[in-house]
């Protein structure tokens, strides 16, 4: 069971300091941006991280949403990353959810975060380079210290 607590506005970056944003086709990607670029591209660069109380504490349970024309929430249903047109619900009556991720700091690196799927244990949000693009994917952790599954989260409130 997950019960919604507070939400915060955040900028999410990969370890190359590229900013996560949602393009016009609702596609998540990471791009080099100055702070000015980041502000100019808001709200597509600003993510609503909603925290949830977890009946089985396993890390900080969160949803990740973005509000452009409508609110879309990140899902990893079927191990496929997509943004679904929905508000983060107040309550989720299950121990797993396709929209709940466990946000945890990387051991020894308090400022680096990982997001593990609550539906698929051992699967993490990751940044993958494909052609000249840096995409958001879901990835099974294969090796310790995999930098592709580490992010920084900067609160904008």
């Amino acid at each position: 069971y997950f019960g919604k607590l507070e939400s915060k506005l955040s900028v999410i970056r990969n370890l190359n300091d590229q900013v996560l944003f949602i393009d016009q086709g609702n596609r998540p990607l990471f791009e080099d941006m100055t702070d000015s670029d980041c502000r100019d591209n808001a709200p597509r660069t600003i993510f609503i991280i909603s925290m949830y109380k977890d009946s089985q504490p396993r890390g900080m349970a969160v949803t990740i949403s973005v509000k452009c024309e409508k609110i879309s929430t990140l899902s990893c249903e079927n191990k496929i990353i997509s943004f679904k047109e929905m508000n983060p619900p107040d309550n989720i009556k299950d121990t797993k959810s396709d929209i709940i991720f466990f946000q945890r700091s990387v051991p020894g690196h308090d400022n680096k975060m990982q997001f593990e799927s609550s539906s698929y244990e051992g699967y993490f949000l990751a940044c993958e380079k494909e052609r000249d693009l840096f995409k958001l994917i879901l990835k099974k952790e294969d090796e310790l210290g995999d930098r592709s599954i580490m992010f920084t989260v900067q609160n904008e409130d």
Epitope: N78, K79, I80, I81, S82, E130, K135, I137
Partner: antibody, heavy 121, light 108 residues
Amino acid sequence: EVQLVQSGTEVKKPGESLKISCKGSGYTVTSYWIGWVRQMPGKGLEWMGFIYPGDSETRYSPTFQGQVTISADKSFNTAFLQWSSLKASDTAMYYCARVGSGWYPYTFDIWGQGTLVTVSS
Amino acid sequence: EIVMTQSPATLSVSPGERATLSCRASESASSNLAWYQQKPGQAPRLFIYTASTRATDIPARFSGSGSGTEFTLTISSLQSEDFAVYYCQQYNNWPSITFGQGTRLEIK
């Protein structure tokens, strides 16, 4: 380059077995579903099944369940489609295609070039 | 399963003219619909997803519309390279995806 490369044309007799392959490169193959699609001569596209190479989870179309086997070898970034006993009606072009994630979710965003299978006595 | 029906089966249009291809779902597919183009001897190529969003490098003359059970692919001014077979595909209840039977767009 992001691509799926399929094995070559096959000519087989009815009753024979066959395994065709689809090798992904240029992306994290273990993080995307691969689908198999049949196209019989002069006909449309039919979804056969999916495999997630990261853990070999499979989903089959009811039409093809029990008729074919889909597998993967993640160490070689390769998915396979196999038949234990071919029929003349299996003659078709078979495509593998990647299922989009993040970008183009749930659609087939990258396609292999196709493997033509001909079954004839 | 959701059955997808495309019409017409064949559409004859002159270059420079507008082409409108239709796709109907037997039950709601929401906006979870894609369009693919296939040329002879080639694999299909993704053109439109979520009913109306063009994939990368797809020209602006292609536009998709619709939701629920009725969908349309429109090509505003046909170029010679646009003559091909177009398939719609629903993915609303993935993994149970289904394709339409295709519309052949030919030169008039």
